[in-house]
């Protein structure tokens, strides 16, 4: 008669942990003829160290059900059994769950903390932001995101085998030109007959597309680059400037900025 | 990250022999079984035969019983495939891949090609 | 032997379609069957282990199911980089065996 009353035992402690090495045996009641060989469901290329015994090394958190069989003449299989590894959390991930489209300043913003996967079940999460704890909820929420806002968020989450991080997420806002301000250079007192540069400094993202250059009289000139250069530059040219940015989020405008052109000592001398 | 390098493939005539080598690196090489699988020009894909992770139990495809032997030195991370009294239909691409928790191969190598021919 | 037998074994298909790749085991094998995609002149890369759990790495819009003698894999949305063939592989006893392999083409 076949082996009688065939089981797969697991000789471990629980629970398993992923990474263990995981020892089965193959146990049977009575058997005639003699058992005299095991087989084992699924095949793992697994180490036999001697009849009957299967060991795993550096158990994967997959393993699911192991059957053995003892066979004579005839082989019978065993109920299988399921290792119920115990693993940490797996493929954590940020995920922008609000807005759906593009964040732009001002907008409320929703990060979910995904996994796929965690044994045991429990978990805690924990959000970073060049490493420093900003929650420990599975979502991040900001009601009204600002530029200062963006950066490399990071999300945890832990159960009582250990913790994963997701890869770092980079929050990107947009918003409209902003801290515009004229720099001049090589100053704001310029001599006539020389040169002078007007710069539209500014923050925006995306970066301004273009620019607007404006005189004391709230005319519009004709130049549409960030640099605004006066060359020669003369008397007629004094007064107050401001520049208009924009980028596809809208426009933002700088405070005025005095520009003054005195004489040269030529032109003194004549007079 | 896991890296696996074929070696040694080439041309021999039937009768002849030739060891394959898989050189391993980015995961810790003992802890891993491992497998050759091969392919024939335009077929599909057959598997050779596989090691447990410390060497001691090995396992084969009736068609190489008795001609091919696998090995690994853990010293060196390296698989090795010998192969003895070749045929023309061992002709193929022979890749190394490594064993996942059971036999399912997570990383292969890029392959290396043998030719059996007169 | 278990024989594992893929259909259909080439298909002709357009981006964006939903494709289906069945794998029938000779035998019941449980869950212990893979998938794996092969891009031509590269080594098979590994997509679904245990019937279905997705491979790390591995998009979403590969999905298997099955379990005993009928397996599927499934790509929900066609994209043009899963061009190649797909290879169904039981691991229940040895040999280990692959199906026949399904090409896939763009129409």
């Known amino acids: 008669y076949p082996p009688k009353k065939v089981t797969t035992v697991i000789q471990n402690p629980m629970p398993i942990r992923e990474g263990d090495t995981v020892t089965l045996s193959c146990n049977y009641n009575s058997s005639n003829p003699s058992v005299t060989r095991y087989e084992w469901k699924p095949h793992g290329a697994w180490e036999e160290p001697s009849l009957g015994v299967l060991k795993i090394q550096n158990v994967g958190w997959d393993n699911t059900t192991i059957a053995c069989a003892a066979c004579n003449s005839w082989c019978s299989w065993a109920s299988p059994v399921a290792l119920n590894v115990q693993y940490a959390p797996r493929d954590v991930r940020v995920r922008k769950i609000k807005p759906l489209s593009e964040i732009h300043s001002g907008n409320s913003v929703s990060l979910q903390c995904d996994f796929s996967s965690s044994h045991p079940k429990e978990v805690q999460f924990f959000w970073e932001k060049n490493g420093r704890l900003l929650g420990k909820e599975s979502q991040l929420n900001f009601d009204s995101i600002s530029p200062e806002d963006a950066g490399s968020y990071s999300c945890w989450v832990n159960n009582s085998i250990g913790q994963t991080a997701s890869k770092a997420w980079t929050l990107e806002v947009l918003y409209a030109p902003r801290r515009l301000r004229v720099s001049m250079s090589p100053g704001d007192q310029v001599m006539e007959g020389k040169s002078a540069t007007l710069t539209c400094e500014s923050d925006a993202n995306p970066p301004v597309s273009h620019y607007t250059w404006f005189d004391w009289n709230n005319q519009s000139l004709p130049y549409h680059s960030q640099k605004l250069r006066l060359e020669p530059v003369k008397v007629q040219h004094s007064g107050a400037y401001w520049c208009q940015g924009t980028n596809s989020v809208g426009k933002g405008r700088s405070p005025l900025s005095t520009l003054t052109v005195y004489y040269s000592p030529e032109t003194i001398g004549r007079r | 990250q896991v890296q696996l390098v074929e070696s040694g493939g080439g041309l021999v005539q039937p009768g002849g022999s030739l060891r394959l080598s898989c050189a391993a690196s980015?995961?810790?090489?003992?802890?891993?079984?491992m497998s050759w699988v091969r392919q024939a020009p335009g077929k599909g894909l057959e598997w050779v035969s596989s090691i447990s992770g410390s060497g001691g139990s090995t396992y084969y495809a009736d068609s190489v019983k008795g001609r091919f032997t696998i090995s690994r030195d853990t010293s060196k991370n390296t698989l090795y495939l010998q192969m003895n009294s070749l045929r023309a239909e061992d002709t193929a691409v022979y890749y190394c891949?490594?064993?996942?928790?059971?036999?399912?191969?997570?990383?292969w190598g890029q392959g290396t090609l043998v030719t059996v021919s007169s | 032997d278990i024989q594992l037998t893929q259909s259909p074994s080439s298909l002709s298909t357009s981006v964006g379609d939903r494709v289906t790749i069945t794998c029938q085991a000779s035998?019941?094998?449980?869950?212990?069957l893979n998938w794996y995609q092969q891009k031509p002149g590269k080594a098979p890369n590994l997509l679904i282990y245990a019937a279905s759990n997705l491979q790390t790495g591995v998009p979403s819009r590969f999905s298997g199911r099955g379990s005993g003698t009928d397996f599927t894999l499934t790509i929900s949305s066609l994209q043009p980089e899963d061009i190649a063939t797909y290879y169904c592989?039981?691991?229940?006893?040895?040999?280990?065996?692959f199906g026949q392999g399904t090409r896939l083409e763009i129409k």
């Open positions: 891949a490594r064993y996942g928790s059971a036999a399912w191969m997570d990383s």
């Open positions: 980015g995961f810790t090489f003992s802890n891993y079984a």
């Open positions: 592989q039981q691991y229940d006893g040895l040999p280990l065996t």
């Open positions: 035998h019941d094998i449980r869950n212990y």
